[in-house]
């Protein structure tokens, strides 16, 4: 009795983070013995799609011509060979950006910061959100991922950095998201250039507690100024 069929490999081109309206192709690669490929989407009736293999039969293509909210989510694929179905692939998380208007990203007290001092990056969204992501250009993964502890909706999240070193210099953007689907992100914020001067090669710092703030009423500034902060967001390093 042969062992279980090896699991296929699942990936997306041009990538797994796709802007609304753009096309994306999901590939599932199995073995040359594959007769059929199946793609399942979490929380969707299975199978989400089936495809015959492309020659030489070791992979199949699943095309999404125009990315929308419905396609965002977590996928796995399988293939069927003469001896049965394979193990599921590792999951592919397909994320859509452009689901919400872009947040604004600020550096306080200034984007020009001296090494050894503190700076806070502030990401503010137009509508209340419960997840904020801060990314640095050319970094492989989000630097920081703030999520509300209790589903509380916030208009902003703070990303403190202290003490700042040369490592922190660079271009940042942030995204916001709702808890009901973390596969749907806002447009990216405009870029923020953080410039660190007088750089000393300090050890890599650990961030301090993150803070979120609720929006004020309509007769107050549209983004809160001087609201009492409360730590409703939990920090995740990725």
């Amino acid at each position: 009795q042969a062992g279980p069929l090896p699991k296929p490999t699942l990936w997306a081109e041009p990538g797994s983070v796709i802007s609304w309206g753009n096309s994306v192709t999901i590939w599932c690669q199995g073995t040359l013995e594959a007769r059929e490929y199946r793609l399942d989407k979490e929380e969707s009736p299975a199978p989400w799609d089936r495809q015959n293999p492309l020659e030489p039969k070791n992979k199949a293509r699943f095309s999404i011509p125009s990315m929308t909210e419905d396609y965002a989510g977590r996928y796995r694929c399988y293939y069927r060979s003469p001896v049965g179905w394979s193990q599921p692939s590792d999951p592919l998380e397909l994320v859509m950006t452009g689901a919400y208007s872009k947040p604004t990203l600020s550096a306080l007290p200034s984007p020009l910061v001296t090494s050894g001092k503190s700076v806070t990056l502030l990401c503010q969204s137009r509508s209340p959100m419960d997840t904020f992501l801060l990314i640095k250009e050319r970094a492989a993964h989000p630097l920081l991922h703030l999520r509300s502890e209790h589903g509380a909706q916030q208009h902003q999240a703070e990303f403190p950095m202290s003490p700042v070193t040369s490592v922190h210099g660079g271009t940042y953007r942030c995204f916001s998201s709702h808890g009901f689907s973390h596969y749907l992100l806002s447009h990216p914020s405009d870029p923020l250039e953080l410039i660190v001067s007088g750089s000393l090669e300090d050890p890599r710092p650990s961030p301090t507690r993150s803070v979120s703030t609720a929006a004020g009423p309509e007769d107050q500034p549209l983004m809160p100024t001087g609201s009492v902060p409360h730590s409703g967001l939990r920090r995740h390093w990725e």
Epitope: G21, E69, G98, S186, D219, M223, T225, G226
Partner: antibody
């Protein structure tokens, strides 16, 4: 590309109501606020209010409260603004506009509403 | 409500020359939470809807020529067109988004001298 396409011109009698539509395309409709702005002939811009298609949340300028109603049909990506008890000073071009961050990055082409007896 | 006042009401500038439009708010538009000014500028040509030029007082919208520049802070703001082109003939509006109701300036009509 983002587009906001509004319904055609309307001529109404004083006291009547008008319902203007704004059909959105080219972006994720639910996640962006849509506002309405009034521009009387040869005059400036006046904010009327907004609707958030995701949950139907609305907020109106106090000046229009009681006379304006904004609604959304997510199935057709369309928002509506109804203005009741029309008077001559409601004669204007009415624009829908997509909010970016309280400012407006895309505008409809405008709908002319003429109130005349 | 925050009152936005533009000056001048109309302006005639020669092609290639600098045009400057001012906008004054009845209260500060500078947020202490993020040190940003909640002010936008729009251009409106006859028979067309307004077009966003500048937001956060000085950030140019994508696709807007770099001859358009916004400056100022607090209550006093300026839109500058560094070298006027024929296609810049329009009415320009400032808008505050610091608090509801959102309000606009009365507009400045820019013409060719």
């Amino acid at each position: 590309q983002v587009q906001l396409v509004q319904s055609g011109a309307e001529v109404k009698k004083p006291g009547a109501s008008v319902k203007v539509s704004c059909k959105a395309s080219g972006y994720s409709f639910s996640g962006f606020y849509i506002d309405w702005v009034k521009q009387p002939p040869g005059k400036g811009l006046e904010w009327i209010g907004y609707i958030f298609p995701s949950n139907g949340e609305t907020s109106y300028n106090q000046k229009f409260k009681g006379r304006v109603t904004m609604t959304v049909d997510k199935s057709t990506s369309t928002v509506y603004m109804e203005l009741s008890s029309l008077r001559s000073e409601d004669t204007a071009v009415y624009y829908c506009a997509r909010q970016a961050f309280y400012y407006f990055d895309y505008w409809g082409q405008g709908t002319t509403v003429t109130v005349s007896s | 409500d925050i009152v936005m006042t533009q000056s001048p009401d109309s302006l005639a500038v020669s092609l290639g020359e600098r045009a400057t439009i001012n906008c004054k708010s009845s209260q500060s538009l500078l947020s202490s939470s993020n040190q940003k000014n909640y002010l936008a500028w729009y251009q409106q040509k006859p028979g067309q809807p307004p077009k966003l030029l500048i937001y956060w007082a000085s950030t140019r919208e994508s696709g807007v020529p770099d001859r358009f520049a916004g400056s100022g802070s607090g209550t006093d703001f300026t839109l500058t067109i560094s070298s006027l082109q024929a296609e810049d003939v329009a009415v320009y509006y400032c808008q505050q988004y610091y608090s509801y109701p959102l309000t606009f300036g009365q507009g400045t009509k820019l013409e060719i001298k």
